[in-house]
Structure formats: C-alpha cells, structure tokens
Interface confidence: low
C-alpha cells in the first residue's frame, strides 16, 4: 500500500492544501484512496510511514510575522483531528519573495478509514512548479 | 534491495552530483548498482522510496539571482528525463556563506533499468563534510 | 520493527537531544527500545531507514558564528561513535529568533544492540512544541 | 505575462527541411527547460524533443538524428531543426515551458503534463 500525490493550485480558502494524481503518481491499489482531493485514506489499520514536502516563497515584510508552518494531520474516525508533525520556517528577506523547502516523514499507526492531510499557514505562498511540493505515504 | 551512497566532490562541471561506496555506505545486494557514480540504477520493477539529502553553502551577493535547486530525476530506459522532486532554497546573506540543507524523498515506480540521480543548480556550492550530502532508495 | 518518538525539553546540557513515548508516538515491540531517553537500540541486525526532524529557533546575533548542525549518530557495541547524517542552516536574521526544520533520513545496517542519537549544536534552541520535534526507524 | 509564439511550419516535401522557432516574451527563456510536442490529427500530443536551462537535449527516438534543438538567449528563442522529414512527422508542433519562480537544472522533461505554458501550435505537413 503506497501513496504519493501531487501539488494542485487551489481557489478555496482553506489552509488545507489540494492534491491530484497528476504527472508521475503514486497509487498502489484501492487500499489507499485521495478523498476530495485534500486527504490520503486507508483502508487498513497498520504502520505507515507518511510523509510531505512543500515548496513555498515567501517575504518577511509581506507575510505575518509568524512564520510559515506546515502540519501533517491526521483525522481517525470518531476522533478529533490531531498534528501528527510540523515543520517552521521564518520568511525571508529576498524580494518579491524567498522559496524555501520543508520536508515531512514520521512513522504512525493509522486506523482503518484514517486520513491524513497537509495544512499550511498561508496557501498562496506554495509553489506548484514540477516535482516542488507532494505527499504520501507507505505502509510498513 | 537498498542503497546509499555519500557525496563527493567532482571536478567536473556538470550539475549531476557525484557520489561513492564510502564511509557507512550502503548497497543491499546486486539489483541496485552505483553507476559511473552519479545514478543508482535498479533491476527490478517495483514501488521504490527514493530520496536524498543536500547541504550547501551559498551567498545571495555572490550567486545567481535564481535559488538553489536540488532536484531528483529519473531515466527510465527508452523514455525522457523526467523531474520527481524539488526543493528550493533562496541563498543565505550570510558571510562567507550560509549553510542549508534540503532533503528530498518520495514513492515511485521503477522500470527495470531505471536510474534515478541528482541534479543541483550549482555543484560548487555543496558541501561534502561527513553526513551532509547523501542519496539512497529502498524497495517497498 | 518501528518506532517514533517525540522531543522533550531537557536541563541537561548536553549536546544529545531527549525523546519520550508520549503524545502519538510509536514502538511497535520490544526489538527496539528507547534508553535513557536518549537512543533508539535495536536488538535484530538489518537495515533500517532512519530518520530526524528537529525544529529549532535561534539569531544570528545570539549565537555563534557557527550554524545550527543536527547530527544522526550511531553507537554499535564496541565501536566508536560515528556519525550517519548531518543537515547544516544558518542562523535566521529574524528576531527574536526565527524558525527553520531540519529533516535528515537514510537507509543504514544496525548491528544487534546498536544505539542512534542525535546531536544538536545548541538544544536549547530546538522547539518542543506539538510534532516540532521527532526521530525515528523502520526496519526494511 | 509569460508567451510562447511557434513559427516556421508549412508544407514540405518528404526528405526535406524545417526549421521551428519558438520565441518567449514575458520571461528569460534561459533559466527554464523547453520542450517541443506534436500532436498529428486523431493522436495524442506526443514529447518530440527539449533543452534545459544549461543546453543539454533529449530526443524521442524516432527522431534521433534527424531533428536537433538549440537555443539563442540573446534572442530568447528555441528552434527545432527538422531534418529528412517523413510523412509520419505531420502534426502540429508546440513549443511549452514551466517557470515556476526557478530553473530546472540540467534535466529537461517531455511529459506534456509538466509544462505550464504553450504556445498556439505551428502545422507541419510532409507531404509529396
């Protein structure tokens, strides 16, 4: 049971990010499934290695003072959702905007019908361009 | 079948990094092999976690404008190139140079005979201190 | 054979980052403990992919000219210490100090009762705050 | 805004020549990989050929020998020298690209579906 999908530019407002089986995808078999596009379901309890990267590009005087965060969740069902990891980076001072890349990767039991997502502090700042910003997951 | 494999510098002029069977290496056995040591080439078919780590050194007077960019790519036989993952870092204004590192890794299907190596934006900048740069895959 | 665990604030002062089995963490049987709090032991040989995520917050002004260094290190018994992987970022200019993540990961053969640890320039910079902070291994 | 023009298409004889350009507006053409597609009538938009930021080229094999890509930064245009055309290289021809805040390295990709941008296409039809 493998997973690996890929960056999609979003409309929606949410600081959930989007995802497609587009370019050179991951999707094993039907044991793991991309629900609306924002989230990785299994169908199997067990011990996966989930992981996510993302590319974004960002400028200290244009963005919040807090950095940018990026959070793997994970929503079990009947359970609240909860972080599972996060990673921090502080804006830079490169102009009109500095990239930076975040790396994610932990292993976790996951229930049957878990799902696991990605959440970042500012959507707009990722970078979609090939290959820059993807996530999945294996199971051990 | 898994490998990794550690950096090292090349006087060559090319943007694919070079790496050796040194230090604490790892080659599993004879389906994956190191070759002309730049790609890891592997001989069985299959679901693969791929990844790699890059630290480098680098100035934002003394670089291009553009940032540096580690990217991981593949060549199946018969096929194109192709880009599988990214990760960009603007430069540091740090003096001489600030250091960064980026680690790429994801899930992939390989072909028989499938390489995958590593591309960066400027080979000069990486760094080859133990531990720093380094690359490897394992099969699912 | 898995686990991950989660950074703990230490007083100590030493350089070797602390972890507990707290919040979502994971160890899948007693073939891999966590001593002392400290380190990761196996008890079977064989390859492992392992892995760190540290988050850490610190300024350029404040600490030394040095950058921030997060080392993996593994002790097998009657061995020396060594060490497996380093990530390397230069301090932010932010302030009061600004966030960066490293990710470090590779796949390494573990003898029966060898320890990894990891190292960081300066703990008391590193952030503990909720999946900031992880290690952890699989066995292929 | 970022803009692709192919030019150079028409009608040619079999064995004959070509000569395809694909100027950029908008961006420094130099920095990104570019690629060259066809989609003959009826077919799938195929990879034909693309160069990278630092001129290294790749080629379908069906046309190894025959077509070669270059680059003029100064101009900030592509070309694609057809050679020894053959009726099965009818199609339309489009130049594309993916600046993405970056450049590709030396790796360049003729999967259509990593390209942002294209052109509008230029119709080359061997024919005697």
């Known amino acids: 049971i493998a997973a690996h999908v890929i960056s999609e530019a979003s409309s929606k407002t949410t600081s959930v990010l989007q995802w497609a089986e587009k370019g050179y995808y991951t999707m094993s078999n039907n044991l793991v499934t991309l629900e609306n596009g924002k989230q990785l379901t299994v169908k199997r309890q067990g011990l996966y290695y989930i992981y996510a990267q993302v590319t974004f590009c960002s400028n200290r005087e244009a963005s919040s003072q807090a950095p940018f965060i990026a959070s793997l969740c994970l929503k079990s069902p009947g359970r609240f959702e909860r972080i599972l990891l996060r990673a921090a980076n502080t804006h830079s001072s490169a102009k009109p905007c500095g990239q930076q890349s975040i790396h994610l990767g932990g292993v976790f039991e996951l229930q049957p019908g878990a799902s696991v997502f990605v959440n970042v502090t500012d959507p707009s700042q990722v970078s979609h361009g090939t290959g820059f910003t993807s996530f999945g997951l294996l199971k051990l | 079948i898994a490998a990794h494999v550690i950096s090292e510098a090349s006087s060559k002029t090319t943007s694919v990094l070079q790496w050796a069977e040194k230090g604490y290496y790892t080659m599993s056995n004879n389906l994956v092999t190191l070759e002309n040591g730049k790609q890891l080439t592997v001989k069985r078919q299959g679901l693969y976690y791929i990844y790699a780590q890059v630290t480098f050194c680098s100035n934002r007077e003394a670089s291009s404008q553009a940032p540096f960019i580690a990217s991981l790519c593949l060549k199946s036989p018969g096929r194109f190139e192709r880009i599988l993952l990214r990760a960009a870092n603007t430069h540091s204004s740090a003096k001489p140079c600030g250091q960064q590192s980026i680690h790429l890794g994801g899930v992939f299907e390989l072909q028989p005979g499938a390489s995958v190596f590593v591309n960066v934006t400027d080979p000069s900048q990486v760094s080859h201190g133990t531990g720093f740069t380094s690359f490897g895959l394992l099969k699912l | 054979i898995a686990a991950h665990v989660i950074s703990e604030a230490s007083s100590k002062t030493t350089s070797v980052l602390q972890w507990a089995e707290k919040g979502y963490y994971t160890m899948s049987n007693n073939l891999v403990t966590l001593e002392n709090g400290k380190q990761l032991t196996v008890k079977r040989q064989g390859l492992y992919y392992i892995y760190a995520q540290v988050t850490f917050c610190s300024n350029r002004e404040a600490s030394s000219q040095a950058p921030f260094i997060a080392s993996l290190c593994l002790k097998s018994p009657g061995r020396f210490e060594r060490i497996l992987l380093r990530a390397a970022n230069t301090h932010s200019s932010a302030k009061p100090c600004g966030q960066q993540s490293i990710h470090l990961g590779g796949v390494f053969e573990l003898q029966p009762g060898a320890s990894v640890f990891v190292n960081v320039t300066d703990p008391s910079q590193v952030s503990h705050g909720t999946g900031f902070t992880s290690f952890g291994l699989l066995k292929l | 805004e970022v803009q692709l023009v192919e030019s150079g298409g028409g009608l040619v004889q079999p064995g004959g020549s070509l000569r395809l350009s694909c100027a950029a507006s908008?961006?420094?053409?130099?920095?990104?990989?570019i690629g060259w597609f066809r989609q003959a009538p009826g077919k799938e938009r195929e990879g034909v050929s693309c160069?990278?930021?630092?001129?290294?080229?790749s080629y379908t094999d069906s046309v190894k020998g025959r077509f070669t890509i270059s680059r003029d930064n100064a101009k900030n245009t592509v070309y694609l020298q057809m050679n020894s055309l053959k009726p099965e290289d009818t199609a339309v021809y489009y130049c594309a690209t993916d600046p993405d805040r970056g450049f590709l390295g030396s790796s360049c990709d003729t999967q259509s579906h990593q390209y942002d941008y294209w052109g509008q296409g230029t119709l080359v039809t061997v024919s005697s």
């Open positions: 908008g961006f420094t053409l130099e920095y990104y990989a």
């Open positions: 160069i990278s930021s630092e001129g290294s080229t």
